[in-house]
């Protein structure tokens, strides 16, 4: 039975040009972490995995940091960066938890980040 | 295209090591973790373990835990899986194998190296 | 470790006959990631399906894939003279990735 639940930053906004965090928690869990899967829409981002280390995918390896933790820095961002990301937690026994967040990447200098979430 | 070669067929006594290297082309090396399968004659596929070229990180079945040592030369493109007191239930094919760590699977191998383990 | 057992271990079919190949994992942990590989002797394994169903680039449409948590099925619709071969599952829940034990297609 899958008890965890996953917190993430939830809806967040930040400035074109800057840079922003990505973090999710697992909590409410005794599973272990093997792997966690940073999406954006279908497309892979990054790859913690336990063992291995990190995986940065090709095409973003110039804007995308690992870290801090298990989450995820994205730079220089564009307004094309908007939309859902996606934590995918990989965990044994339980299997797989995911966790959203919006980003909303403002030309404006006034970006002001969401309220934490919980996603069951 | 993509392509994993490996090293020649070796014969080794027991209590020897043995290294076997796999050189890959068609593809930038350390955008992709690196694994070895084997495979006992006439029987089914046992996974080994698995480097990250990245950063050096490895992964490997417990089985193999302190027996098995997995390396990687970025400067040559190269990942080397070397098993060490070697006995007779190790004469296997040994392949190389390139991991799609998104999905965890393998799609492209090696041709494999053949290990004899024999006095 | 997450055994993976297949069935059948072998099997005799003729060409055009539907072939349906299993996987069942031991534990109730649900497993995360499923490959299928076909391998003809003296060969490399070939990677046909990843992620239970999602087909490899240039593998025929007759292969599919399906299943979850515990239970996974590879299907050749229609079988062809050169699929009789041994197909082999393989999961990952957590380290140890594990194969399953082999079905071999071979002609009635």
């Known amino acids: 039975m899958m008890t965890g639940t996953i917190e993430t930053t939830g809806n967040i906004s930040a400035e074109k040009g800057g840079s922003i965090i990505l973090q999710c928690h697992l909590s409410s869990t005794t599973a272990q972490v093997t792997q966690v899967n940073w999406e954006q829409q279908d497309q892979l981002l990054a790859i913690c995995n336990a063992d291995l280390g990190w995986h940065i995918s090709p095409s973003f390896k110039d804007r995308v940091a690992p870290g801090p933790g298990l989450g995820l820095t994205l730079q220089s961002l564009t307004v094309n960066d908007t939309g859902e990301y996606f934590c995918i937690y990989h965990t044994y026994p339980d299997g797989t938890y995911t966790g959203r967040i919006f980003l909303e990447v403002l030309e404006s200098s006034v970006a002001e980040h969401g309220a934490r979430f919980q996603i069951p | 295209q993509v392509q994993l070669v490996q090293s020649g067929a070796e014969v080794k006594k027991p209590g020897a090591s043995v290294k076997v290297s796999c050189k890959v082309s068609g593809y930038t090396f350390t955008e992709y973790t690196m694994h070895w399968v084997r495979q006992a004659p006439g029987k089914g596929l046992e996974w080994m373990g698995g480097?990250?070229?990245?950063?050096?990180?490895?992964i490997y079945a417990q089985k193999f835990q302190g027996r098995v040592t997995m390396t990687e030369d970025t400067s040559t493109d190269t990942a080397y899986m070397e098993l060490s007191s070697l006995r007779s239930e190790d004469t296997a094919v040994y392949y190389c194998?390139?991991?799609?760590?998104?999905?965890?699977?393998?799609?492209?191998w090696g041709r494999g190296t053949l290990v004899t383990v024999s006095s | 470790d997450i055994q993976m057992t297949q069935s059948p271990s072998s099997l005799s079919a003729s060409v055009g006959d539907r072939v349906t190949i299993t996987c069942r994992a031991s534990a109730s942990s649900n497993v995360i990631y499923l490959a299928w590989y076909q391998q003809k002797p003296g060969k490399a394994p070939k990677l046909l399906l990843y992620d239970t169903s999602r087909l490899e680039s240039g593998v025929p449409s007759r292969f599919s894939g399906s299943g979850s948590g515990t239970d996974y099925t590879l299907t050749i619709s229609s079988l062809q003279p050169e699929d009789f071969a041994t197909y082999y599952c393989?999961?990952?829940?957590?380290?140890?990735?594990?194969f399953g034990g082999g079905t071999k297609v071979e002609i009635k």
């Open positions: 194998a390139r991991l799609v760590l998104r999905y965890w699977y393998f799609d492209v």
């Open positions: 480097i990250n070229p990245n950063n050096g990180g490895t």
């Open positions: 393989q999961q990952w829940s957590s380290n140890p990735l594990t």
